[in-house]
Amino acid sequence: EAHKSEIAHRYNDLGEQHFKGLVLIAFSQYLQKCSYDEHAKLVQEVTDFAKTCVADESAANCDKSLHTLFGDKLCAIPNLRENYGELADCCTKQEPERNECFLQHKDDNPSLPPFERPEAEAMCTSFKENPTTFMGHYLHEVARRHPYFYAPELLYYAEQYNEILTQCCAEADKESCLTPKLDGVKEKALVSSVRQRMKCSSMQKFGERAFKAWAVARLSQTFPNADFAEITKLATDLTKVNKECCHGDLLECADDRAELAKYMCENQATISSKLQTCCDKPLLKKAHCLSEVEHDTMPADLPAIAADFVEDQEVCKNYAEAKDVFLGTFLYEYSRRHPDYSVSLLLRLAKKYEATLEKCCAEANPPACYGTVLAEFQPLVEEPKNLVKTNCDLYEKLGEYGFQNAILVRYTQKAPQVSTPTLVEAARNLGRVGTKCCTLPEDQRLPCVEDYLSAILNRVCLLHEKTPVSEHVTKCCSGSLVERRPCFSALTVDETYVPKEFKAETFTFHSDICTLPEKEKQIKKQTALAELVKHKPKATAEQLKTVMDDFAQFLDTCCKAADKDTCFSTEGPNLVTRCKDALA
């Protein structure tokens, strides 16, 4: 239904707290360099204005669209051009072009310092002094670093943060209570961020149809007892929610997500037997819980799908009459039978089926032609299964750090032109797949591994798009989203690459490395490893292991030495010489 005042409508639906949080996220995601105080001021102004519209929907400007209202606010910020350069040009445009322009200027890799967590005492003090401001800072800092973070989900993580602080700040040992809990939230939030960015990429590059196909596959796996009409309805609603969030329409997105959660909880009987626990929770927890609810028990004795999709003489007629519905039904039937497959694999199978029908239905004897589709699926299914087996075996042998290093070597060889920080970030993230997925039961490994890898590789593509340097990466990133992971897996050593010359300073370390946290030490060592591979792309695993072991030994020795500086300055050059010799 149409509302006289959109802003009043959203304020009423969402309530003041969520309204303010979402507006803060929206502004922080659009203008990523502004300080918290600048944004907080704008949020307060917008909220005050929303309240006047709630009191009187006919008041001046209350009938304006949210894009107009928010865009006008952003464009009124002083020194916009000095701080944001050409983003200020967006303000010369009219809606909807102005909002599109803002979206195009979102930076996936803003040059902001890493979000440092204050020490426990300081954190608890500022939280107790003003919990609202404290949580506002959290939303601002996460949103500006992750400009496509799923806004209603960020409110959920802020709520988690709040609950952890409330609990731990009352403990005697605040530090040991806070650290593991906040680390857990941070890890989950980072994964949520790359997953959502993937969804937005799908929407931006391939449109709603591509996202809806993703949603049909995912929902069919989770709700195998729901019928096709129900899955289609859920997929349509979920597509709308994600389109809004990816498009910066965060109030509408959060409101529609709440509506979708309400619908699911009111229709459990036709959706899934596993929803009740989620539906008993308050809004943010409920929506989060529904988004990762366990798969419903699959109905036993589902028939083979060949009857409808291969053996039926009417296949081509059914396909021609309603292509998207027929393919959607195929995807639904395949996905509900295969919770053990990744969504990416299911979409590749549907794509192969579509291509087969396009080809075969134009031939003289279509059934003879599409009758072989089953055999054509075999390599598509076996490739990711082998990938999971090989990589999980390697992870179990090497552990997370060693596995990251193996991936780092592999990816530096595939795309040595990519910057070392990007390669290290990618390898570290890709390597976490082992810890995240390889410990799961067999039938959950493939979906976990492949869908996570796809999301990480999407980030690699986004970063590479800004400064394209590798033809290998460009090739894999310009294809369809579901083909990316197999494309990257199939890449081999880039034979066109001219090795980097050996620079001693790249491998020169100082005693300050000894006091770094373990994670930072690892990054330093992995940076050196990537540089070694760039110097010798065809170095064997043995050679690289020798050098890295020597390097680890050197760090261990010098960090334990009484005079660390002397040890680093005398032993360092020896290490460099040994490295050069080992790789010669």
Epitope: M298, A300, D301, A304, I305, E333, R337, D340, Y341, F377
Partner: nanobody
Framework: EVQLVESGGGVVQPGDSLRLSCAAS????????MGWFRQAPGKEREFVSA????????YYANSVKGRFTISRDNSKNTVYLQLNSLRPEDTALYYC?????????????????WGQGTLVTVSS
Amino acid sequence: EVQLVESGGGVVQPGDSLRLSCAASGGTFSTYVMGWFRQAPGKEREFVSAISQNSIHTYYANSVKGRFTISRDNSKNTVYLQLNSLRPEDTALYYCAASRFTSWYTADYEYDYWGQGTLVTVSS
């Protein structure tokens, strides 16, 4: 981890019958689709027959339709394949396989667990 052990193979003459059994352990048998595949010397492995969890659906390769019958007993964690009117071309190593998740029933790549096989030889 599901373990499958086939039995019942042997040497028979054309036209004779055999009953193959496959005993499963280590999983909830009633949640698995069960299948039989065979591999003749020098040939690729091929689908023979499959049965759904509660025996509602059964599937057969065209070459065995009307001669072979698949059945299962969930209380005994066992699947059977009755082979009648055997022919020399039925000579092969017969494998039992289990799948939690299948769209086709006939695709070997959808089966996660396999037995070692039992040999059937049909010869005059």
